[in-house]
């Protein structure tokens, strides 16, 4: 199963199958995730280490048990690769990085206003792969300003310096935000030439695509079929690069495929898994386990719950099968490709789905109408599991926020309902940046089913929660994702890092804003909270959020909406907003539903009909 | 309308206990905090303890612990506050109050009065 | 345990004059404190809380100001109505009332 715990100051010893330069433990995390053999990382921050050549040391390791042991290390930080977390499972990388200089192939020097204005350059730059940016203060004065875009061999950095005002990042391609475009046509019987990146063995076309794709570097390929005249290069994709980004030239060969890497798509890229199964075809590799199942499918689900398995193939030859039931070859390679592709055999292959980051059709877990003041622009993709909830009626207007929680869930609060408890009148955009990109012809969800808290009131504050199950599922994309939901009763976690996000009045008396508005607001005790709200109780149940001396805040138009919190690196859903004493007032903190409180009656009202808890546990 | 409807004065002997109700009505108490306060003749305002219905959980001023207890029945929505081992110390104004974080909406009072 | 030391305990003073009540508290009670009035026969009603926030109904002639441990509560300009004894209040750490001021007219 998924596993997103991280263990501080632990170090697992053994298992290496690589190592690289990361600037913190979730991109480690994420390369961890995406490598084929990686199923534990350890990683070693500037501070626990003297050894310079190990700071900032991202080391990827593999266990036949799925564990090893774990020895003391100071500050080091060690977890659990994200294979079959589902939507957690993505190869994008926002953060920005201050103090710290990412080393590599300078190949673009430009100057710049801003380190966001650097991260666009290298998002939207083919060969760009990371970036360091020198700030205004910059010690060297004619380096200041300067937007060095990199890549190197592996697509990590080739060394990590902490350096004084310079702030480094990664592109944001794999976050689906590249202004390039890109190519999705296939090219039958033509070959590109330039350099081989890397060459592994595919049952398609498609398949190399996508390990184009999420290949570093890799920004196109020639995919040989299984019907090509050399025998021993049948079936192999090679992957390649160029100077210019560009293949250089191409030539028409017969049995040859040809295409561009997804990259530098606009809003939506490849899942970076292959689901179709290959009827006919043998993938050889090392076995992993063999087990007699019933169809080719359950064999595919066997091998994508096997953590390590990467393919499988189904026999159906008389001698491999009992009754219903055939033999299932769990199978593994080096790179995650097969080692032998064979045709015109009585089985069946395909790959795992451990990558795959639609998930099951569940929501995700681990074990007065208010309102964004003092908050500032979102970006696309930076808050997927936010949602639009509207009302038509004669005309069509933004009435709250909500939070995506399953494929077919969005959780948010019971007062946005009142008065207009028809499932008809609604509307719910998601994966939307700005409300006025929405035209006649944007899809929206219809909703199933309205569920208000059984205690929620009219006009009460009181358990301020209501779900809402969706018509039809929506597929995940980097856009449209859920956001995870905190443990029952989860009181000791201490969250330093929350947001609150929506369309609401960006002043008491405002109106709907455009884009998708966020801000940085601290959490306040329920002690401190209560003694700001001299006639209202705050209870358990609720959780307060607010600056002291006021200025950012929720608004009308914001209510429903996710307060969320970052903690390990994971995003949780810790509040829903609920209510407060106008907007942004000073000293009157905002007061959100405690969700972790709301956790048994979420789970309760999601249990699919056939009584499987629609709940996905990354804990 | 938010009203506090307190039962009426009681005259009591040294040593005896007493409890005092306090009926909400306009609102639930189970959504509120309720709390007691002692008004001794001719004094100040003393704070006794406090009680969230919804749970029972009490907080009570350190110096009277004992003295009072605070109770609450959410289906007649009402409160109460016993007081046990009366002395003429005891003879007060005992008020009930409803609020979050502070006293808002007080009732009108109960006098009760210890004599032999 | 926080003590509040309210004064003056009792004061006249002419329709239309400013009235000055302070409180001290024995710790910095961080600006947690409320004012409430009580007229004869009456239960106390909430004025002011957190330091100077009125509260909702209350004229603008009252008021309240001050920090740490020493605070102060205005009345602009006395009316006949305002006739009471006024209480201070700390909610900072339980509760804990001032004496009490009794408010007279001259």
């Known amino acids: 199963g998924c596993l997103t715990q991280l263990y501080e100051n632990a170090f697992f010893r053994g298992g290496d199958v690589a190592s690289m330069y990361t600037p913190n433990a979730q991109y480690c995390q994420m390369r961890c995730t995406f490598h084929p053999r990686c199923l534990l990382f350890s990683f070693l921050p500037a501070s626990s280490i003297n050894d310079m050549e190990k700071r900032f040391g991202c080391f990827l390791k593999d266990s036949v048990t799925g564990t090893l042991p774990k020895v003391h290390r100071t500050g080091a930080v060690s977890g659990h690769s994200l294979k079959q977390c589902g939507h957690q499972i993505s190869a994008c990388h926002r953060d920005i990085y201050k103090g710290v200089d990412m080393r590599g192939v300078n190949f673009n020097v430009s100057k710049v206003s801003s380190v966001e204005e650097c991260q666009k350059r290298c998002t939207s730059n083919i060969r760009c792969q990371f970036f360091s940016y020198a700030t205004q203060t910059f010690h060297k004065a004619e380096y200041r300003n300067n937007c060095l875009l990199k890549y190197s061999p592996g697509g990590t950095p080739t060394a990590i310096k902490v350096l004084s005002n310079v702030e480094s990042g990664f592109s944001l391609k794999p976050c689906a935000l590249s202004e390039i475009g890109c190519h999705m046509n296939i090219f039958q019987h033509l070959a590109f030439s330039d350099v081989d990146v890397a060459r592994v063995l595919t049952p398609d076309a498609f398949v190399c695509r996508t390990i184009c794709t999420y290949h570093p570097n890799c920004l196109f390929f020639t995919f040989y079929t299984n019907v090509w005249k050399i025998e021993s290069q049948r079936n192999v994709c090679l992957l390649k690069t160029s100077e210019s980004g560009t293949p250089s030239s191409s030539t028409p060969q017969e049995n040859t495929i040809s295409g561009y890497s997804l990259l530098t798509c606009k809003r939506t890229l490849p899942e970076p898994c292959h689901s179709k199964i290959y009827p006919g075809v043998d993938f050889g590799g090392e076995e992993l386990n063999v087990t007699f199942v019933k169809g080719v499918n359950v064999c595919q689900e066997t091998c994508t719950k096997m953590i390590r398995c990467q393919f499988f193939t189904y026999s159906l030859l008389p001698e491999d099968c009992k009754e219903e039931k055939c033999k299932c070859f769990l199978r593994l390679s080096m790179d995650g490709s097969p080692t032998r592709i064979a045709y015109g055999t009585q089985g069946s292959s395909g790959y795992s789905l451990r990558l795959c980051n639609t998930g099951d059709n569940s929501v995700c877990t681990t074990k007065t109408s208010t309102r964004i003041v003092g908050g500032t622009n979102s970006s696309w993709g930076e808050w997927p599991w936010q949602v639009s909830l509207q009302v038509k009626l004669t005309a069509q207007r933004h009435l709250c926020g909500g939070s995506l929680i399953g494929h077919q869930w969005v959780l948010t609060a019971a007062h946005c309902f009142d008065g207009l408890p028809l499932q008809d009148v609604w509307r719910i955009y998601s994966g939307i940046l700005n409300l006025s990109d929405i035209t006649k012809d944007t899809p929206f969800s219809q909703i199933k089913e309205i569920i208000i808290h059984q205690n929620y009131k009219v006009s009460e504050g009181n358990h301020d929660i209501a779900l809402i199950k969706l018509q039809a599922p929506l597929n995940y994309t980097e856009f449209q994702k859920p956001i995870c939901l905190p443990s029952k009763g989860d009181t000791s976690t201490i969250y330093t890092n929350c947001w609150v996000t929506g369309w609401g009045f960006s002043k008491e008396k405002g109106e709907i804003q455009n884009i998708l508005q966020k801000v940085n607001i601290p959490l306040v005790t329920n002690e401190e909270c209560q003694k700001r709200y001299q006639d209202y109780k705050i209870t358990q149940r609720m959780v307060c959020a607010g600056y002291k001396e006021g200025g950012k805040d929720a608004c009308k138009g914001d209510s429903g909406g996710p307060l969320v919190c970052k903690h390990n690196g994971m995003w949780r859903l810790v509040g829903i907003t609920s209510w407060g004493e106008g907007c942004a007032r000073r000293e009157q903190p905002g007061v959100y539903t405690k969700v972790a409180e709301y956790m048994d009656w979420i789970l309760e009202k999601t249990q699919s009909s056939d009584g499987k808890a629609q709940m996905q546990s990354p804990a | 309308e938010v009203q506090l409807q307190q039962s009426g004065a009681e005259l009591v002997k040294p040593g005896a206990s007493v409890r005092l109700s306090c009926t909400a009505s306009?609102?639930?108490?189970?959504?509120?905090?309720i709390f007691w306060v002692k008004q001794r003749p001719k004094q100040g305002l003393e704070w006794i303890g406090r009680?969230?219905?919804?749970?029972?959980?009490?907080k009570y001023d350190p110096k009277i612990q004992g003295k009072a207890t605070l109770t609450a029945d959410t289906s007649s929505n009402t409160a109460y506050l016993q007081l046990s081992s009366l002395t003429s110390e005891d003879s007060a104004i005992y008020y009930c109050?409803?609020?979050?974080?502070?006293?808002?909406?007080w009732g009108q009072g109960t006098l009760v009065s210890v004599s032999a | 345990d926080i003590q509040m030391t309210q004064s003056p305990s009792a004061m006249s003073a002419s329709v239309g004059d400013r009235v000055t009540i302070t409180c001290e508290a024995s710790h910095d009670i961080n600006n947690y404190i409320a004012w409430y009035q009580q007229k004869p026969g009456q239960p106390p009603k909430l004025l002011i809380y957190?330091?100077?926030t009125l509260q909702s109904g209350v004229p603008s002639r009252f008021s309240g100001s001050g920090s740490g441990t020493d605070f102060t509560f205005t009345i602009s300009s006395l009316q006949p109505e305002d006739i009471a004894t006024y209480y201070c209040l700390q909610y900072d750490n339980l509760f804990t009332f001032g004496q009490g001021t009794k408010v007279e007219i001259k």
């Open positions: 306009g609102f639930n108490i189970k959504d509120t905090y």
């Open positions: 009680i969230d219905p919804e749970n029972d959980n009490t």
């Open positions: 957190y330091t100077s």
């Open positions: 109050a409803k609020g979050g974080g502070l006293f808002a909406y």
